[in-house]
């Protein structure tokens, strides 16, 4: 039994790290393999993760970690029974993939403005709580080419856009994701999307801005 692609891990920097790797051939990950991990610290327990299959030869493991600090370092040992297949280490703060934002809501009753709000997925005592910025994706349900991304580079989990920038009488969807620049993180997964109907009507004058000239012969 051989490891083809060594484990690579990402952390949500609150409680969960996810490691993925590929084996040399078809493997029943949960029956044949164990990933043992331990925080390098005075008082730390040895933890064991039972991997799941991710394709025929791919394995994925969800590592539970507590109360992370920036200096944390974990030893990782991949075992097949009594055989040590791979040994490595993992520093969560250097491989951050934030949790996805939650509770995305679209308010359409603000005059001519769409207000999108969502919640920061971290509690206030977590380092990432004040570090996240966001990207909001809005798209037309019936026209995949009508899609745009808004970068929210401030920390407030809200976005205001003019309803007039979207097509009238069309259903739109939005989703949001997060990243932490200061930790050089990757983007989070997208949040679940939310749907609304853009009922905004353009002012009458905009429809009739051209003038009719009558010529007399």
């Amino acid at each position: 039994m051989k490891v083809l692609q060594e484990p690579t891990c990402v952390s949500d920097y609150i409680s969960l790290s996810t490691c993925e790797w590929k084996m040399g051939g078809p493997t029943n990950c949960s029956a044949e393999l164990r990933l043992v991990y331990q925080l390098v610290f005075l008082i730390s327990e040895t933890n064991m993760c039972v991997p799941e299959n991710n394709g025929a030869a791919g394995c994925v493991c969800h590592l539970f970690m507590e109360d992370m600090v920036g200096a944390d370092n974990y030893t990782l040992d991949l075992w097949a029974g009594q055989q040590l297949l791979w040994k490595g280490s993992f520093k969560p703060s250097e491989h951050v993939k934030p949790k996805a934002p939650e509770n995305l809501t679209v308010y359409t009753n603000v005059s001519e403005t769409l207000l999108l709000t969502w919640s920061n997925p971290y509690p206030p005592d977590n380092y990432l709580y004040e570090k996240l910025t966001y990207a909001v994706n809005i798209w037309n349900e019936n026209d995949p080419t009508d899609s745009r991304i808004y970068d929210v580079t401030y920390q407030e989990p809200t976005l205001r856009i003019a309803a007039s920038t979207l097509k009238s009488g069309v259903s739109y969807r939005a989703r949001v994701r997060a990243w932490a620049q200061s930790y050089n993180s990757t983007w989070s997964e997208w949040s679940p999307s939310t749907k609304w109907y853009n009922a905004y009507k353009e002012p009458f004058e905009k429809h009739h801005h051209h003038h009719h000239h009558h010529h007399h012969h």
Epitope: S15, L16, V40, L42, D67, V69, G70, A71, S93, Y127
Partner: antibody, heavy 116, light 112 residues
């Protein structure tokens, strides 16, 4: 052996500031959160705040916001807490504690007495 | 802020008897990672507090097995099965799940 050695007792005037220190031995403070806990004479324990010494990220109980400032120097393995604009209500023993992820190691405490 | 209410304030016990201390939180203290960071500390006169129990039920290393923790949600209990003279002091519960972290008011265990 794991130890948290705190600075000695301090007698300070009302309105002044004081900076308490807490030096760790037997472990690296970067591997834990460093907390401070207040204990007024003959009273209970009150959580003040904490720091992650790796990145300096601090969080405080709201009543100590503006009163306490927690810092850390990883090169000397020391955590600090500065208390400002002292009043008689700040007279207490202040404990530094490392938490990972519970309060396993406590300093001996520093008595701060505020008196004219 | 989460209020941690301990009862009784004072607990007179005979040596060898069982003692029970209650701690009630004003709201759930389950952390977003699923753990309940409810701890018990003992402070003896002139000393700093010492950890007895973490995550509701786990005894810290070196803590005698006569100490046990139980509970869930908002109600927690520390039991000492056979009180010894060295157990005297003030017991504090503590929640480390939600900022600001908070201690209970303390229960003084004394000899009857």
């Amino acid at each position: 052996e794991v130890q948290l050695q705190q600075s000695g007792a301090d007698l300070v005037r009302p309105g002044a500031s004081v900076k308490l220190s807490c030096t760790a031995s037997g472990f690296n403070i970067k591997d834990t959160y460093m907390h401070w806990v207040k204990q007024r004479p003959e009273q209970g324990l009150e959580w003040v705040g904490r720091i992650d010494p790796t990145n300096g990220y601090t969080i405080y109980a709201s009543k100590f916001q503006g009163k306490a400032t927690i810092t850390a120097d990883t090169s000397s393995n020391t955590a600090y807490m500065q208390l400002s604009s002292l009043t008689s209500g700040d007279t207490a023993v202040y404990h530094c504690v490392s938490r990972r992820p519970w309060f396993a190691y406590w300093g001996q405490g520093t008595l701060v007495t505020v008196s004219a | 802020d989460i209020l941690m209410t301990q009862t009784p304030l004072s607990l007179p016990v005979s040596l060898g008897a069982q003692a029970s201390i209650s701690c009630r939180s004003s709201q759930s203290i389950v952390h977003s990672n699923g753990n309940t960071y409810l701890e018990w500390y003992l402070q003896k006169p002139g000393q700093s507090p010492k950890l007895l129990i973490y995550k509701v039920t786990n005894r810290f290393s070196g803590v005698p097995d006569r100490f046990s923790g139980s509970g869930s949600g908002t109600d927690f209990t520390l039991k000492i099965s056979r009180v010894e003279a060295e157990d005297l002091g003030i017991y504090y519960c503590f929640q480390g799940s939600h900022v600001p972290y908070t201690f209970g008011g303390g229960t003084k265990l004394e000899i009857k």
